[in-house]
Interface confidence: low
């Protein structure tokens, strides 16, 4: 076995927006890390049989397998997968080692399967069997967090309950507004699940694996605030935990804080007080108020007064499933050309929402804001001016929702002509929807100003695949009009287009545009 | 549903007093507190006082000695005494009970 060639099997993942995939399967962009699929030889198989270890790989995601051979001279190779011969082109890398590669675009049911490998070299024939299957993300979850208070301590735990095990992290920001956005400089992450500060502005958890990411956002009463015009609202489920942090500065110490619901005191046990002094010797408390698992009646305002500030209050709703509320009637929009212009939705939701803006059968990322009266609001304003129809979806664990709008462009009609032996057709997708007039050219009309009414049929505005409106209208030819130019016009309150017929016998039809 | 509406405000002389009151419908009065917060031209809603549920009140410190709050549950209704006034006093009286607002009523402090 000494004739044997050293050989390395790797697996190369491409991330899902790399360009550098390439088309062909012999020359693939290296993108990632090449993972070692090891490549032992089978034992008690008939030749030499080697086996990559087993590949799995995400629906949509785009990968390479990768053979590379340390054989002396020239090696020839085949690819063969579910009984079909495909194309192999061995190259040599800078190590001289022969280099096979099969690359698989955005992974399908279909592509998953057995893939052989037949590699002869100089010395001697062999196989390599790779098997790749569709990773069964069916099992795979990823919950929102959610908090515990850590056993005789003062610190809170986040848990997500996660297939497989999440990367938790702590997202903390002790600036107020915008600039506690991710990705601003204000905002620090902790990888871990235990938090011990808990004193900051904003606290939220995240938990994040090859589903996406999750967040949660400790509910928090700030008492040195103004208080919204709006009540702030606190949708749980019911069995859900529910944690409100109350949060007070004072000058000294001499300040007590109290949570009520519906003005009864919580009871022991459902609250704990932690408090610190800032850098400017100030007394910082915050006063946590929890439920371990909420009921219906947990339902109702949650008071948090302070011997020295003004009271604040926090409507906590239980349901018994999520909702997305939102009016779903469609809305239909006109703009100009270039006027700026965003489609909007604004909805109440819980859990929070996943949704995507979709248009020409594309679809676009969907991002949402939070209102300060507790609605959401997403908007979309990438639309380029193209006219049609734009949908927006939503969806949590409990509810879906779908709202259409349509956006037209006003613009001038533009006029495309076509004829055959027994009528000329002109089309046009201006907005507002045009007009139409025919007119026919003569000696007697060289202006082609004389109008022509009979045997013109104008249909109704008909809708194309994605909402776009379009025009027409049809001229019957008759005896009276054969051999002359005729004009159709489109008009609407934006302008005039032309197009202007030959109406010869049967064969070719020039046409002049007339603008 | 609660609705609040506050009554009293006028054009006063600095020196002067006033007293603000407001009237809430529905049954959830004596058990809320009842906040006062005002708002001068241009300038941010500031609070001004509370009144607890049992009768305990809380002020803006600059403010205290020269404002009272009270309260009378059998009347629905949260009043505001303000003496000495000053011409920084000027501003529109809101009162607000969990997150139901009054319309407002102006107070003008003018010699």
């Known amino acids: 076995n000494q004739d044997l060639p050293v050989i390395k099997c790797v697996l190369i993942n491409h991330k899902n927006n790399d360009s550098s995939v390439g088309k062909s399967s012999s020359y693939p962009m290296v993108s990632e890390s090449p993972e070692d699929l090891g490549c032992a030889l089978r034992p008690q198989s008939s030749g030499t049989v080697y086996e990559a270890a087993a590949v799995e790989v995400d629906v949509s995601a785009s990968i390479t397998l990768q053979v590379l051979v340390d054989a002396p001279g020239n090696i020839s190779c085949l690819w063969v997968f579910k009984h079909s011969s495909l194309n192999c082109q061995p190259h040599f890398d800078l190590q001289n080692r022969g280099v096979v590669s099969m690359v698989i675009l955005k992974m399908t049911e279909t592509q998953a399967g057995e893939y052989l490998l037949f590699i002869q070299s100089e010395a001697t024939n062999y196989t390599i069997l790779f098997t790749v299957s569709i990773r069964n993300t069916l099992l795979y979850t990823l919950r929102r967090p959610y908090f515990r208070k850590m056993e005789n301590q003062d610190a809170l735990v986040c848990i997500s309950e996660s297939v497989p095990e999440p990367i938790v992290e702590w997202v903390l920001c002790d600036s107020q507004g915008e600039s506690c956005k991710e990705e601003s400089p204000a905002v620090v992450k902790k990888e871990e699940k235990v938090l011990h500060e808990l004193f900051g502005t904003d606290i939220r958890c995240c938990a994040r694996n090859e589903l996406g990411r999750e967040c949660t956002r400790l509910f928090t009463i700030d008492l040195n605030q103004t208080p919204q015009t709006t009540l702030p609202q606190l949708f749980l489920k019911v069995g859900e935990p529910l944690w409100i942090r109350c949060k007070a500065v004072h000058v000294n110490h001499g300040f007590g804080l109290t949570w009520e619901l519906e003005n009864k005191a919580l009871e022991e046990g459902n609250y704990f007080e932690m408090s610190t002094y800032s850098t400017n010797r100030t007394m910082i408390r915050i006063l946590f108020a929890f439920v371990s698992s909420v009921a219906r009646n947990d339902t109702g305002y949650y008071t948090c007064s302070s011997s020295k500030h003004p009271s604040q209050s926090a409507l906590v709703t239980i349901v018994e499933k999520g909702f997305i509320n939102a009016t779903n009637s469609s809305e239909d929009y006109e703009i100009d050309q270039y006027e700026e212009f965003c489609f909007s939705v604004r909805f109440k939701a819980y859990p929070q929402i996943r949704c995507t803006w979709t248009f020409s059968r594309k679809s676009f990322p969907c991002e949402q804001k939070g209102l300060d009266n507790g609605y959401s609001i997403s908007k979309f304003c990438n639309h380029k001016h193209q006219p049609g129809e734009y949908i927006f979806h939503a969806e949590n664990d409990d509810a879906q929702f779908t709202k259409m709008f349509t956006l037209n462009i006003r613009r001038k009609p533009q006029v495309l002509a076509e004829a055959s032996a027994s009528q000329a057709s002109c089309f046009s997708d201006g907005y507002p929807l045009p007009s139409w007039t025919w007119k026919k050219c003569s000696d007697k009309s060289p202006n082609c100003t004389e109008e022509i009414t009979e045997g013109v049929w104008n249909r109704k505005a008909n809708r194309k695949v994605f909402g776009q409106w379009v025009s027409s209208s049809t001229l019957n030819m008759s005896e009276a009009i054969k051999g002359f130019l005729v004009k159709c016009c489109a008009y609407n309150s934006l302008g005039t287009s032309c197009e202007t017929i030959l109406l010869n016998s049967p064969g070719p039809f020039p046409f002049i545009q007339d603008n | 549903q609660v609705q609040l509406q506050e009554s009293g405000g006028g054009l006063v002389q600095p020196g002067g007093s006033l007293t603000l009151s407001c009237a809430a419908s529905?049954?959830?009065?004596?058990?809320?507190?009842i906040d006062w917060y005002r708002q001068a031209p241009g300038k941010q809603r500031e609070w001004v006082a509370q009144?607890?549920?049992?009768?305990?009140?809380h002020y803006e410190p600059s403010l205290k000695g020269r404002f009272t709050i009270s309260r009378d549950n059998a009347k629905n209704t949260a009043y505001l005494q303000m003496n000495s006034l000053k011409p920084e006093d000027t501003a529109v009286y809101y009162c607000?009970?969990?997150?139901?607002w009054g319309q407002g009523t102006q107070v003008t402090v003018s010699s």
């Open positions: 009144i607890t549920s049992g009768g305990n009140t």
């Open positions: 607000r009970i969990l997150d139901y």
């Open positions: 529905g049954s959830t009065f004596s058990r809320n507190y």
